[in-house]
């Protein structure tokens, strides 16, 4: 029951996390323009992974996508890649985990198969969460670097004078969404991995013991062997116990489905 709850909760947490990673990736507010020391206070600028937007106090918003001719920094491309990899891995993980859920029966799927699928999806969620956290952190580092490097200057450009106004970009809402979402996906993945341990059937290699009916010497056989059917070769009427006798370290183990007298 606890295993099912852990697996189910892990799935739900990861689902919320991946939805958050998708939302963060699509959001425009990765960086917001700090209007301190800016003469155009009626206008607010924010930039995302895909486009830059200008919003006015009147409510008017205009967004423009980034074009390759602008020479986008490699770091931005890296962040895009990390977020997309995170989404893809998370989506595959979700698909795998649906079939791995203990509460869902698909044909005669073995518990061992479900355990493997749970572990696989768990690892995928962990990597997905780490990708998102890494992507958001790289972008945050870019902002911090940009914040301290921004300066005001003046120069003559094509067609006239050009002034650079000191505009600083600060953390946008998408960064916090990304961090939280990545963390949730990571937690969900860990929960799936924990659930996997409970799902996996414990394989026990019992030391079989053969007893003579006459009560003479007991022959201990070090390895497990096939239980006799009671016909054919077992002519001396030996009682065969597959795991009938157990060593001390095996007392805690669960009985095998082959245990019989």
């Amino acid at each position: 029951m606890a295993v099912t709850a852990c697996q189910g909760l892990g799935f739900v947490v990861s689902l919320i996390g991946i939805a958050g990673i998708i939302a963060a990736t699509c959001m425009d507010q990765w960086s917001t323009q700090d209007l301190y020391n800016n003469p155009v206070t009626a206008v607010f600028n924010y930039q995302g992974l895909w486009r830059s937007c200008v919003r006015e106090s009147s409510g008017f918003t205009e967004c423009r996508g980034y074009f390759t001719l602008l020479g986008l920094p490699a770091m931005l491309q890296a962040v895009r890649a990390l977020m997309i990899v995170g989404i893809v891995l998370g989506a595959i993980g979700l698909l795998v985990s649906i079939f791995a859920l203990k509460c869902i029966r698909i044909g005669s799927m073995e518990d061992s198969a479900k355990a493997n699928m749970t572990l696989t999806s768990g690892i995928m969620f962990i990597v997905s969460g780490l990708c998102a956290i890494a992507g958001v952190s790289v972008f945050a580092n870019m902002l911090v670097t940009n914040f301290w490097m921004s300066t005001a200057n003046m120069y003559t450009g094509m067609g006239g004078m050009v002034q650079t106004v000191q505009t600083r970009y600060t953390f946008g809402a998408a960064l916090f969404v990304g961090w939280v979402a990545g963390g949730l996906t990571l937690i969900g993945g860990v929960m799936m991995c924990i659930a996997c341990r409970g799902l996996a059937p414990e394989e026990t290699n019992y030391k079989a013991v053969s007893y003579h009916a006459s009560g003479h010497s007991v022959a201990y056989k070090p390895g497990g062997f096939k239980a006799s059917t009671g016909f054919g070769s077992n002519t001396k009427n030996k009682k065969i116990y597959d795991g009938g006798a157990r060593t001390e370290d095996e007392v805690q183990s669960y009985p095998s489905k082959h245990d019989y007298v």
Epitope: N38, V54, E62, L70, N146, G160, V162, T164, V165
Partner: nanobody
Framework: QVKLEESGGGLVQAGGSLRLSCAVS????????MGWYRQAPGKQRELVAT???????NYSDSVKGRFTISRDNAKNTVYLQMNSLKPEDTAVYYC???????????????WGQGAQVTVSS
């Protein structure tokens, strides 16, 4: 590189009209505001009118009611319709655009080369 190109300047009689236009070309992300400033001989450059992309306009008291600023967002062009011109409107009219050039880049204020407007009495 961003370029501002003005056109429409010239000589006009007092009471006459003139229309200035300014087109922004080049590679940039966003135009924040566009406007017109003027500089009469021996004087400081002063604001005439500005407009945001959303249509919020601002005029100097000396031109209110006579000048009209308008824009074409699709063409990245700003216009200044000047009516009831006076000799004191004689100046070099400069086009201005506040631009965000690229990703995480600082706001840049671009100026045109200027268009001469002369109002004769």
């Amino acid at each position: 590189q961003v370029k501002l190109e003005e056109s429409g300047g010239g000589l006009v009689q007092a009471g006459g009209s003139l229309r200035l236009s300014c087109a922004v070309s080049g590679n940039f992300l966003n135009i924040v505001t566009m406007g017109w400033y003027r500089q009469a001989p021996g004087k400081q450059r002063e604001l005439v009118a500005t407009t945001t992309r959303g249509g919020t306009t601002n005029y100097s008291d000396s031109v209110k009611g006579r000048f009209t600023i308008s824009r074409d967002n699709a063409k990245n062009t700003v216009y200044l319709q000047m009516n009831s011109l006076k000799p004191e409107d004689t100046a070099v009219y400069y086009c201005n655009a506040d631009i965000i050039p690229g990703f995480l880049q600082q706001l840049t204020v671009h100026w045109g080369q200027g268009a001469q407007v002369t109002v004769s009495s």
